[in-house]
Interface confidence: medium
């Protein structure tokens, strides 16, 4: 709306940088062949690039990434009872971001 | 995978709390009748509840929200030239979160 401008602070652009996001650990990251288990914890924090750039033709992208293995609980249900095992999930953290030109292919004339 | 357990740190649950997220300001928040304009900034930071809860039957939800009006630039293109106007967009910030029971309707027998 164009009303109530007085009370409104000027909007500040969300700059292109790493922010903490929540990553859901899906079961198929651990075992694609078996659905009869649960994962704990169900979600973890990761660092990801987000935000906007000053130009329409650029996008906020990770310029440096790091793979981080973490240990989770794989809770298998065997005869209606749980068996706890360990599994490793590799998370991707973004360490640095940059505004990168998006190359859109030109139509062939 | 169940390999390379030694190097992996135990995964820590992403607790249910407010985190900074990026909100894309879509044009229809400002003017649904006209597509011939741009918005600046295209995105802003908001506080939003995210994360997981310790229980299967609960979800991370906002327990306290605050509406925050911000002033953006509406850049109309009139005869191939930009005309700058002000517009207000109301953002929703989450101030507090809680793990709330999700009531799943039981099938009628």
């Amino acid at each position: 709306s164009l009303g109530s401008l007085a009370a409104a602070e000027p909007a500040v652009i969300a700059e292109c940088k790493t922010r903490t996001e929540v990553f859901q650990i899906s079961r198929n990251l651990i075992d694609r062949t078996n659905a009869n288990f649960l994962v704990w914890p169900p979600c973890v924090e990761v660092q990801r690039c987000s935000g906007c750039c000053n130009n329409r033709n650029v996008q906020c992208r990770a310029s440096q990434v790091q793979m981080r293995p973490v240990q989770v609980r794989k809770i298998e249900i065997v005869r209606k009872k749980p068996v706890f095992k360990k599994a490793t999930v590799t998370l991707e953290d973004h360490l640095a971001c940059k505004c990168e030109t998006v190359v859109t292919p030109r139509p062939v004339t | 995978s169940l390999g390379s357990l030694a190097a992996a740190e135990p995964a820590v649950i992403a607790e249910c709390k407010t985190r900074t997220e990026v909100f894309q300001i879509s044009r229809n928040l400002i003017d649904r009748t006209n597509a011939n304009f741009l918005v600046w900034p295209p995105c802003v930071e908001v506080q939003r509840c995210s994360g997981c809860c310790n229980n299967r039957n609960v979800q991370c939800r906002a327990s306290q929200v605050q509406m925050r009006p911000v002033q953006v630039r509406k850049i109309e293109i009139v005869r191939k030239k930009p005309v700058f106007k002000k517009a207000t967009v109301t953002l929703e910030d989450h101030l507090a979160c809680k793990c709330e029971t999700v009531v799943t309707p039981r099938p009628v027998t």
């Epitope: 649960l38 704990w40 609980r73 809770i75 065997v78 005869r79 209606k80 009872k81 749980p82 068996v83 706890f84 095992k85 360990k86 | 169940l2 357990l5 135990p10 310790n54 229980n55 299967r56 039957n57 609960v58």
Partner: antibody
Framework: EVQLVESGGGLVQPGGSLRLSCAAS????????MSWVRQAPGKGLEWVSY????????YYADSVKGRFTISRDNSKNTLYLQMNSLRAEDTAVYYC?????????????WGQGTLVTVSS | SYELTQPPSVSVAPGQTARISCSGD??????VHWYQQKPGQAPVLVIY???NRPSGIPERFSGSNSGNTATLTISGTQAEDEADYYC?????????FGGGTKLTIKR
Amino acid sequence: EVQLVESGGGLVQPGGSLRLSCAASGFTFSSYAMSWVRQAPGKGLEWVSYISDDGSLKYYADSVKGRFTISRDNSKNTLYLQMNSLRAEDTAVYYCARHPYWYGGQLDLWGQGTLVTVSS
Amino acid sequence: SYELTQPPSVSVAPGQTARISCSGDSLGSYFVHWYQQKPGQAPVLVIYDDSNRPSGIPERFSGSNSGNTATLTISGTQAEDEADYYCSAFTHNSDVFGGGTKLTIKR
């Protein structure tokens, strides 16, 4: 204050029955799995039984299977252990303990225990 | 049934490092927890998930777990660390405790 308080222990004859209770306070009882653990005089810890947060999952040590029944009443914030066909070797301090997650995990909160003596 | 084996006793001088072992078949595949119990008291969790310390537990307590052996390490032992220590793992359908280790601080 977050705590667990056991009650119901005492002297019982072999073959007799006893019902232990564990009153929880200071936390959302219905969100946690619970266990009973016992300790015979001068001996080590022995896990007895487990129940999930909603009571849907229960399991028992082989030594008590078929004789003991674990249950919970989330509306009363109380955990129970019904002990039947008691034997001399069931003599122990019985602790109720809390798991931090619905599925189990470590025991992060313990009661002070209640003594059960099975003797004629 | 699954068994966890601990040494019955460990003795250490004050200020020295105490190591208490806990062994079991492929124990490194499971999460191990450690409990401290002083005479006449309920057990207290000191390490969970192999190496994590609950809040309120001193930094001198640490843990590790790989292969067939988990280890509780107490660096710079103090007189108040004298207690029984139990390892525990949730394996196949049951919580299993080790037999316990009595830690004595030599005076």
